[in-house]
Interface confidence: low
């Protein structure tokens, strides 16, 4: 349905600084298909680690940590002429404010690693 003409756009300067949010997520099962095993098959494999914070929504976020400094070659050996680096994504989370058991949250930016990729290392030539 079209937006009510009286409602400010979320980018509008008149948009309220404080809003009510329904935490019942729509399309919750959109990504419920079996997790891929790219983390194991990648030439820059990673492990997933649980980042838990009871003062945040969502309280649990899974983050990737590269297994090696180098990349895995076709024979399964780590090649240190290449580098495994994390792919980082800035996300928005809700931070409880003030802390402990209130229903008041503030948006907060968070940088998370979602996987790793193999890159050519930066070579600094000393003059």
């Amino acid at each position: 349905s079209p937006q009510n003409p009286g409602c400010p756009n979320a980018e509008d300067k008149n948009f309220p600084r404080t809003v009510m949010v329904n935490l019942n997520i729509r399309n919750r099962n959109t990504n419920s298909k079996r997790a891929s095993d790219y983390y194991n098959r990648s030439s820059s494999p990673w492990n997933l680690h649980r980042n838990e914070d009871p003062e945040r929504y969502p309280s649990v976020i899974w983050e990737a940590k590269c297994r090696h400094l180098g990349c895995v070659d076709a024979d399964g050996n780590v090649d240190y002429h290449m580098n495994s680096v994390p792919i980082q994504q800035e996300i928005l989370v809700l931070r409880r404010e003030p802390r402990h058991c209130t229903n008041s949250f503030r948006l907060e930016k968070m940088l998370v690693s979602v996987g790793c990729t193999c890159v050519t290392p930066i070579v600094r030539h000393v003059a």
């Epitope: 680690h49 649980r50 980042n51 009871p54 003062e55 990737a64 940590k65 690693s113």
Partner: nanobody, 122 residues
Amino acid sequence: EVQLVESGGGLVQPGGSLRLSCAASGRTYDAMGWLRQAPGKEREFVAAISGSGDDTYYADSVKGRFTISRDNSKNTLYLQMNSLRPEDTAVYYCATRRGLYYVWDANDYENWGQGTLVTVSS
């Protein structure tokens, strides 16, 4: 803003033990780590621990000798250092970080304590 205060440093003989503590005020559910800086050297990663305390990571040079732990109820991070060597001599810092990617990169740590000096010498 998180404030971090380290304690427990001092002079110890080779082979001895020390336990460092880091008292945190403010938000402390982030991952945390211990890093050190020896005279004339760059800061280097020692150990890190996840916010929940479930995951721990160590530099190869301290693996099997040092143990990182945390007590979230006391907002305190610990580093138990055993079998200390002269090359462990450094100022030890605790610091926070947003996650456990690239734990060995000292530039990825956000809040730093003032440091506590550990000297290993006979």
